[in-house]
Interface confidence: medium
């Protein structure tokens, strides 16, 4: 397998939890607009999941632009962990568990899970890829843990893996420990495989940043994101070399990498938008 010849590093990159956005504009890329002023503003970066500074030109642009860091945080970040822990301790379900399953208005159907308040269990459904509501989970485990009754929620058995929500492929779940690696390649290498909105079944490869390998997926023929390569070699060249291994005392060992000009595309499959 040429993939193994390419590099023998085992990637143990940590995986961020599903991105849950309060407003869809939080997913827009920073847009300085056509004017030439130099104004310090803040935007929400979906890749780092933080509010960051950028220079705004003074006109046009988009709604992902805030006067202050606080305003940005207020509009685009939510403390999911605290909210979920609190509700678990109180043995209450978050309100969104009682919402009906909502595919949203898009047509990029992917498998997701929702809590069905009628049957009192998590069930599978097809999510269109945008809008919808927060009763929408990437994995069955996450849905069970947050919304189902039971003393300890759902316990996965001794494999520590999860179902990938994009294409139902089974991929190892990353351990939630400090990462030994940093990714410095193109940002789209960290996005999930995205079938897109059409109905074709083209053989493509995407970089799975959790396991550090290029994996096949079926591309629909349109839409999707840039984590989409016609060959495994192309995928490896673009993404595999982007990891920098950390060693103790903060030192870095660099691996060779090729960088493409970054064009940020948003993988809407990973974005949960609250209905407004």
């Amino acid at each position: 397998d040429s993939e193994e010849d390419e590099e023998h590093t085992i990637i143990t990159d940590t995986e961020l939890p599903p991105l849950k956005l309060m407003h869809s504009f939080c997913a827009f890329k920073a847009d300085d607009g056509p004017c030439k002023a130099i104004m310090k503003r803040f935007f929400f970066n979906i890749f780092t999941r933080q509010c960051e500074e950028f220079i705004y030109g003074g006109c046009e642009g988009n709604q992902n632009r805030f006067e202050s860091l606080e305003e940005c945080k207020k509009m685009c970040t939510r403390d999911n962990a605290n909210r979920i822990i609190k509700t678990t301790l109180q043995q209450e379900k978050p309100d969104f568990c009682f919402l009906e399953e909502d595919p949203g208005i898009c047509r990029g159907y992917i498998t997701r899970y929702f809590y069905n308040n009628q049957t009192k269990q998590c069930e599978r459904f097809k999510y269109g890829g945008c809008l919808g509501n927060m009763n929408n989970f990437e994995t069955l485990e996450e849905c069970k843990n947050i919304c189902e009754d039971g003393p300890n929620g759902f316990q996965v058995d001794n494999y520590g893996t999860q179902l990938n929500a994009v294409n139902n492929s089974l991929t190892p779940q990353s351990t939630k420990v400090p990462s030994l690696f940093e990714f410095h390649g193109p940002s789209w290498c960290l996005t999930p495989a995205d079938r897109g909105l059409c109905r074709a079944n083209e053989n493509r490869f995407y970089y799975n940043s959790v396991i550090g390998k290029c994996r096949p997926f079926k591309y629909s023929g349109c839409g999707g994101n840039e984590n989409n390569f016609t060959s495994k070699q192309e995928c490896l060249r673009a993404c595999k070399k982007g990891f920098i291994q950390r060693i103790s005392k903060g030192g870095l060992i660099k691996t060779k990498r090729k960088r493409k000009k970054q064009r940020v595309k948003i993988a809407y499959e990973e974005i949960f938008v609250k209905n407004m």
Epitope: Y109, E123, K126, L163, L170, K218
Partner: antibody, heavy 119, light 107 residues
Framework: EVQLVESGGGLVQPGGSLRLSCAAS????????LDWVRQAPGKGLEWVGD????????LYNQKFKGRFTISRDNAKNSLYLQMNSLRAEDTAVYYC????????????WGQGTLVTVSS | DIVMTQSHKFMSTSVGDRVSITCKAS??????VAWYQQKPGQSPRLLIY???TRHTGVPDRFTGCGSGTDYTLTISSVQAEDLALYYC?????????FGGGTKLEMK
């Protein structure tokens, strides 16, 4: 060649238990979810539930939850259906089927095993 | 649960005929519909998934279409080996549910 072979069917009394097995071969067992579907004599198909072979996460048709349990043994490439408190209306051919995520459909089916619940 | 209704339990046809089998969902299933063929004494065989995509090895005389709640499986020129039971199934949400089946038989 993908093959799914069910076994364990037979005659059982009402209230009794039975464990069905499905041996999978011809593909990587942990790459696909597996489903159980049943078909009563002369009737249509009814989905029972499915399992993610890697982590054992299961989804059930609410109708069977509590009485039926789906499990698997990755070392043996095998899927199981434990059926308890059986009733006459559980009489059916039970099929195991591979659930292919790219299709969101069951692309390979076993030949089925007949379960008869009768006194 | 989503109810899938195949209004015709039986359909009579002749070799070479064009036949359409219909299926209606009790709610919008967003094209998440599969069609299966089952011959007597055999297990079901996947024909179509996502309403219109033919499974590998399925002859091109079988086509599927539909959206929302209404779906159709069409056999453009029926062959003798096509005489079987046909089931639609929604894979939009669990529990996955099947139609009652339509038996294609010779006139």
């Amino acid at each position: 060649e993908v093959q799914l072979v069910e076994s364990g069917g037979g005659l059982v009394q009402p209230g009794g238990s039975l464990r069905l097995s499905c041996a999978a071969s011809g593909y990587t067992f942990t790459d696909y979810n597996l489903d159980w579907v049943r078909q009563a004599p002369g009737k249509g198909l009814e989905w029972v539930g499915d399992i993610n072979p890697i982590n054992g996460a299961t989804l059930y048709n609410q109708k069977f939850k509590g009485r039926f349990t789906i499990s698997r043994d990755n070392a043996k490439n095998s899927l199981y259906l434990q059926m308890n408190s059986l009733r006459a209306e559980d009489t059916a051919v039970y099929y195991c089927a591979r659930y292919y995520g790219d299709y969101d459909a069951m692309d390979y089916w076993g030949q089925g095993t007949l379960v008869t619940v009768s006194s | 649960d989503i109810v899938m209704t195949q209004s015709h339990k039986f359909m009579s046809t002749s070799v070479g005929d064009r036949v359409s089998i219909t299926c209606k969902a009790s709610q919008d299933v967003h094209t998440a519909v599969a069609w299966y063929q089952q011959k007597p004494g055999q297990s079901p065989r996947l024909l179509i998934y996502w309403a219109s995509t033919r499974h590998t090895g399925v002859p091109d005389r079988f086509t599927g279409c539909g959206s929302g709640t209404d779906y159709t499986l069409t056999i453009s020129s029926v062959q003798a080996e096509d005489l079987a039971l046909y089931y639609c199934q929604q894979h939009y949400t669990t529990p996955y549910t099947f139609g009652g089946g339509t038996k294609l038989e010779m006139k």
